[in-house]
């Protein structure tokens, strides 16, 4: 056969679908690899061909589009399963070709089993809600194109294993789930089950996402430096190890780039002839506020080092702050020598 532009196996499209549910999979060629869409390709006389390689097999084989009830079908650039079976797992290839042109890409499809509480190996999308921020909604994802707008599906929402009804601050509203005031207790997995009829059959779509309640932008503040502070003095003798922690609290701010750094006499430690090491650790609170600690360490401090200015800086999308550490040389304790003077006075 003639040369074909092979885009390889596109693992970015690691598609996971639930067993015994409908699945519609668009050929990734038109979304990510080619500069034209399916309609343009079709009107230019190009044909879209599908084939697959079963799990743990090397042999490419055509997809059987003659199964009972049209279980697998193709419509334009979409491959349909109505519904999926476990052994549909494999690598699927869509190829666009005519006599002079050929382009193809493969992608993995994994058919996943779920238990009665919707637990499965499915990778779950995460939706962040701001804590105590007013009404916020999540929408049942990836259900577009499964049924026409004339069809009115029934939607049931679950938190974990429990159907959401008469919950205090969570209200199902069709495809949306409204959180009147999000709290930490709302963290968890939420599932919508969409049920719709098609050609005398009933299909279910199950979609689960993780809700994570995070700090609200209303409460966000510039970074707060907890250490160094005015209450702690780093008093050292030459030859001792100097350790100064810089501990900074950052409010959660979506996508903010948080950073902490030290300057010594206004310069980066690298720009000074001094043997400094800096170790960093990062921790997060339940609402994803961040605490960064950077420990500045000088193994054997000199008297010159103890005269330098050590400043911790922090910056986030909310602002920038800096704080100097109080460093001083320990004054040696006076040595008391007892002098006994014996005086003999003659009168």
């Amino acid at each position: 056969s003639e040369r074909c532009d092979d885009w390889g196996l596109d693992t970015m499209r690691q598609i996971q679908v639930f067993e015994d549910e409908p699945a519609r999979i668009k050929c990734p060629l038109f979304e990510h690899f080619l500069k034209f869409n399916y309609s343009t390709a079709h009107s230019a006389g190009l044909t879209l061909i599908w084939y697959w390689t079963r799990q743990d097999r090397d042999l490419e084989e055509p997809i059987n589009f003659r199964l009972p009830e049209n279980r697998i079908s193709k419509e334009k650039d979409v491959l349909w399963f109505r519904p999926t079976l476990l052994n549909d797992t494999g690598n699927y290839t869509c190829m666009l070709r005519n006599t002079t042109y050929c382009s193809k890409v493969a992608f993995p499809l994994e058919v996943v089993q779920k238990d009665s509480c919707f637990n499965s190996p499915m990778k779950l999308p995460v939706h962040k809600l701001y804590i105590e921020y007013g009404i916020q909604r999540i929408t049942c994802p990836n259900v577009d194109g499964y049924f026409p707008s004339s069809v009115k599906p029934t939607i049931t929402w679950y938190m974990g294993c429990y159907k959401i009804q008469n919950f205090n601050n969570v209200i199902p509203e069709g495809m949306n789930l409204s959180f009147l005031i999000a709290l930490i207790s709302n963290n968890g997995n939420y599932t919508c089950v969409v049920t719709y009829p098609e050609n005398g059959r009933t299909f279910h779509l199950t979609r689960t996402l993780t809700v994570k309640v995070v700090g609200s932008p209303k409460n966000a503040v510039p970074p707060v430096i907890h250490s160094p502070n005015d209450h702690v003095v780093y008093e050292k003798e030459p030859g001792e190890e100097l350790l100064i922690p810089c501990t900074v609290y950052f409010s959660f701010l979506m996508d903010s780039r948080n950073e902490v750094w030290w300057t010594i006499d206004g310069k980066k430690p690298d720009d000074i002839t001094i043997d400094v090491t800096i170790n960093e650790s990062i921790s997060h609170s339940r609402t994803e506020d961040e605490t960064r600690t950077q420990i500045l360490s000088i193994k054997k401090v000199t008297s010159e080092d103890l005269k330098r200015s050590y400043v911790c800086h922090a910056r986030s999308a909310k602002g920038e702050v800096a704080k100097a550490a109080k460093v001083k040389q320990k004054v040696p304790a006076p040595r008391y020598t007892v002098e006994l003077a014996c005086g003999f006075g003659a009168t």
């Epitope: 903010s256 780039r257 980066k268 430690p269 090491t277 170790n279 990062i282 910056r315």
Partner: antibody, heavy 111, light 106 residues
Framework: GGGLAKPGGSLKLSCTAS????????MSWVRQSPEKRLEWVAE????????YYSDTVTGRFTISRDNANNALYLEMSSVRSADTAMYFC???????????WGQGTSVTVSS | QIVLTQSPAIMSASPGEKVTMTCSAS?????IHWYRQKPGTSPKRWIY???NLASGVPARFSGSGSGTSYSLTIINMEAEDAATYYC?????????FGGGTRLELK
């Protein structure tokens, strides 16, 4: 080492640093397309425990560092023709700009 | 994500002329950084934290701006200033660059 890769293939870039305290710097990879557009690809914290990626490479590329050997890596998988670019490793101290850029390594993705 | 739009994309100036190029951010950011690149070389830091000149950058360069509007100015264009200038933001992930302004010598 850059080079040529087929679509869907893999490649590993490395960058060796010298002349500065490697662990003091946040390291990044930035690429420049043939059309000369600059695009940030990934960033790694000083200790290596925190990584950040651009949406275009999330799930396909992995940034890592070996502080003992002053080395930065970019493992590229499922590469596409859009990944064709000159890849630069860069360093940044604190929240400041990328104050030094490597000489770059060329990556071409083509079947 | 923050989109940085640089204008003009290409400009030319005569020696001694004043040059201003701009960088507009789609949302408010804390600072902008500028890089300069000459053909066949890596980008070099040029102006950091909006207005600070990197070491070795001539005093005829200056940077200013805040929020969503930033600019780089050369008060006296010289032949060696012909290059491409990129703006860059590191306030939010993903970090982003402008499309560049190519400055040519007239």
């Amino acid at each position: 080492g850059g080079g040529l890769a087929k679509p869907g293939g893999s490649l590993k870039l490395s960058c060796t640093a010298s002349g500065f305290t490697f662990t003091s710097y946040v390291m990044s990879w930035v690429r420049q397309s043939p059309e000369k557009r600059l695009e940030w690809v990934a960033e790694i914290s000083r200790g290596g425990s925190h990584t950040y990626y651009s949406d275009t490479v999330t799930g396909r590329f992995t940034i890592s560092r070996d502080n003992a050997n002053n080395a930065l890596y970019l493992e590229m998988s499922s590469v596409r023709s859009a990944d064709t670019a000159m890849y630069f490793c860069t360093r940044a101290y604190g929240n400041s700009e990328m104050d030094f850029w490597g000489q770059g390594t060329s990556v071409t993705v083509s079947s | 994500q923050i989109v940085l739009t640089q204008s003009p994309a290409i400009m030319s100036a005569s020696p001694g002329e004043k040059v201003t190029m701009t960088c507009s951010a789609s949302s408010s950011i804390s600072y902008i950084h500028w890089y300069r690149q000459k053909p066949g070389t890596s980008p070099k830091r040029w102006i950091y934290d909006t207005s600070n000149l990197a070491s070795g950058v001539p005093a005829r360069f200056s940077g200013s701006g805040s929020g969503t509007s930033y600019s780089l100015t050369i008060i006296n264009m010289e032949a060696e200033d012909a290059a491409t200038y990129y703006c860059h933001q590191r306030t939010y992930y993903p970090l982003t660059f402008g499309g560049g302004t190519r400055l040519e010598l007239k």
